[in-house]
């Protein structure tokens, strides 16, 4: 997917975490058994 940024916005980050995407992780699931 694609996200475009750089459009006008007056919103600001109010939480204590950065709003940038976190580091990628491999979401792997193991079958039970």
């Amino acid at each position: 997917s694609e996200t475009t940024t750089g459009t006008s916005s007056n919103s600001s980050q109010s939480t204590s975490n950065s709003g940038l995407a976190p580091n990628p992780t491999n979401a792997t699931t193991k079958a039970a058994g």
Epitope: E2, T3, S12, Q13, S18, L20, P22, P24, T25, N26
Partner: antibody, heavy 118, light 107 residues
Framework: QVQLVQSGAEVKKPGASVKVSCKAS????????MGWVRQAPGQGLEWMGE????????TFNQKFKSRVTMTRDTSISTAYMELSRLRSDDTAVYYC???????????WGQGTTVTVSS | DIQLTQSPSFLSASVGDRVTITCRAS??????LAWYQQKPGKAPKLLIY???TLHSGIPSRFRGSGSGTEFTLTISSLQPEDFATYYC?????????FGQGTKLEIK
Amino acid sequence: QVQLVQSGAEVKKPGASVKVSCKASGYDFTGYHMGWVRQAPGQGLEWMGEINPITSDKTFNQKFKSRVTMTRDTSISTAYMELSRLRSDDTAVYYCARRDYGTSLDYWGQGTTVTVSS
Amino acid sequence: DIQLTQSPSFLSASVGDRVTITCRASASISKYLAWYQQKPGKAPKLLIYAGSTLHSGIPSRFRGSGSGTEFTLTISSLQPEDFATYYCQQHNEYPIIFGQGTKLEIK
């Protein structure tokens, strides 16, 4: 040690496209976003966008959205940035940079000079 | 978009001096400001992230402080290798934005 090695300098004519590569080593390529930043001669730094190497999700600066294509090949730990419909004001040094969530753009490639001239 | 304004744009100083560069954000970016050093013909190098955390291998004479909208980079005792251009960059939200740079020159 972390290393990002970029492809060599390019000279292009207006209207053409350029594709810059960035080969990563010394870390897990899929564990960090790869960003692209450019710097026109004598000017400051301008973020173009980034790609998630696992999902290929991209986030772009609006300014470049219609002209930039970011891809990656995880099998060779390499990211690519292609800029199309080149203009003279695209003449710049293009950098790839690893983005870590906590530390931001922590390691940079050496830069690729792209000259657009007729 | 967040805008970052650095001051001064140019700074002349001598070896051993203490210098301070300021970066102001147009809206709060919490603590998420990074500082980079760039020398001519070279890629930028990360010095400080999250406002005040020194990146690995960076000498302790570099110090970052601030939060919200006002941040400073202080170099406590200038060394010859510190003469370069310094950029701030917010890493709180997209789009990632850099300040316009501060060129630190030898007096």
